[in-house]
C-alpha cells in the first residue's frame, strides 16, 4: 500500500529536494526559503529567485520552508515553574526548562511542569534525578514509598498497599494493642 500523501506533500514530491511546486503553475519548481525566513512571493519563473523575507521579532522558522508566515515564538510558562534556557531567534524557538534540582513532568506532549527532585530522606537514592524523571528512592526498613517520599510505617493503614512492606510493624502494633499491657 502506498501511504496517503497530503496535497502539499504530493506537490513537493514532484520537485527536487529543496524546491516546491509553484501553487499557480505546476510546471515551475521554486527554491524553498532558508530557516529564519518565510515565503513573501513565489518565484516568477523557472530559475528565478523566490522572494523570502526574514522573520520579524517574536517569530521564527526552524527549517527550510514555503510558509506564508513565520511561527510565533513559544513563551515559557512561569505558572508551571518553567524558566527560559535560550531565547527565541529567527531560526530557533524559545527553549524552556527547569531550574537546578528539578525535573520535568509532561502532562501532555507539549505541556510540562517543573517539580523538585526527591531527596530520599529516610531512604537511599536508587536512580538519580534526571531531566525528565524524578529521583527513584529505596526506603529504609520501617518506611514505605508514598508519592515518592519515604513515610514511616506508623502511617500505614491496613487498607493501603504499604501493608506488605510494613507487615512486621503492623503486626507488632496490633500485638501491642491486643496484649492489654500497661
Amino acid at each position: 500500500l502506498v501511504p496517503h500523501l497530503g496535497d502539499r506533500e504530493k506537490r513537493d514530491s514532484v520537485c527536487p529536494q529543496g524546491k516546491y511546486i509553484h501553487p499557480q503553475n505546476n510546471s515551475i519548481c521554486c527554491t524553498k526559503c532558508h530557516k529564519g525566513t518565510y515565503l513573501y512571493n513565489d518565484c516568477p519563473g523557472p530559475g528565478q529567485d523566490t522572494d523570502c523575507r526574514e522573520c520579524e521579532s517574536g517569530s521564527f522558522t526552524a527549517s527550510e520552508n514555503h510558509l506564508r508566515h513565520c511561527l510565533s515564538c513559544s513563551k515559557c510558562r512561569k505558572e508551571m515553574g518553567q524558566v527560559e534556557i535560550s531565547s527565541c531567534t529567527v531560526d530557533r524557538d524559545t527553549v524552556c526548562g527547569c531550574r537546578k534540582n528539578q525535573y520535568r513532568h509532561y502532562w501532555s506532549e507539549n505541556l510540562f511542569q517543573c517539580f523538585n527532585c526527591s531527596l530520599c530522606l529516610n531512604g537511599t537514592v536508587h536512580l538519580s534525578c534526571q531531566e525528565k524523571q524524578n529521583t527513584v528512592c529505596t526506603c529504609h526498613a520501617g518506611f514505605f514509598l508514598r508519592e515518592n517520599e519515604c513515610v514511616s510505617c506508623s502511617n500505614c493503614k491496613k487498607s493501603l498497599e504499604c501493608t506488605k512492606l510494613c507487615l512486621p510493624q503492623i503486626e507488632n502494633v496490633k500485638g501491642t494493642e491486643d496484649s492489654g499491657t500497661t
Partner: nanobody, 119 residues
Framework: EVQLLESGGGLIQPGGSLRLSCAAS????????MVWVRQAPGKGLEWVSH????????YYADSVEGRFTISRDNSKNTLYLQMNSLRAEDTAVYYC????????????RGQGTLVTVSS
C-alpha cells in the same frame, strides 16, 4: 478544608455548548492557578486547560483549542469552562483542580461533573 464543587454537566448533542462551573472554598482562590482535567470512560486523566492567578495566557490542550474557553471570577471564587462545538470524544467526567505543587498528582480536585455528547 479545600473544597471544589463542579456543576453544569449533562447530556448534549454534538455541536452544542455547555458551561461548567467550579465553586471553590477553603483556600485563597485568587492565589492559585486552576486546572480543568477530564477522564473519558476507560481512559486516564487528560489535562484540558489551566489559567493562572490573574487569568492571563490560558493554556488549552490541542484537542480543545478554539472550542473551549477557561475563565475565572476571583470575586466569586469560581472557575468556568465554556465548551462550544462539542464532539462525541469530549464525553468525560470533568474535574476542576488546584495546580499540583509537590509532585505530579492532584492533592485537591473536585468530585467531577459528567458531560455526555451524544445524538
Amino acid at each position: 478544608e479545600v473544597q471544589l464543587l463542579e456543576s453544569g454537566g449533562g447530556l448534549i448533542q454534538p455541536g452544542g455548548s455547555l458551561r461548567l462551573s467550579c465553586a471553590a472554598s477553603g483556600f485563597t482562590f485568587a492565589h492559585e492557578t486552576m486546572v480543568w482535567v477530564r477522564q473519558a470512560p476507560g481512559k486516564g486523566l487528560e489535562w484540558v486547560s489551566h489559567i493562572d492567578r490573574v487569568g492571563q495566557d490560558p493554556y488549552y490542550a490541542d484537542s480543545v483549542e478554539g472550542r473551549f474557553t477557561i475563565s475565572r471570577d476571583n470575586s466569586k471564587n469560581t472557575l468556568y469552562l465554556q465548551m462550544n462545538s462539542l464532539r462525541a470524544e469530549d464525553t468525560a467526567v470533568y474535574y476542576c483542580a488546584l495546580l499540583p505543587k509537590r509532585g505530579p498528582w492532584f492533592d485537591y480536585r473536585g468530585q467531577g461533573t459528567l458531560v455526555t455528547v451524544s445524538s
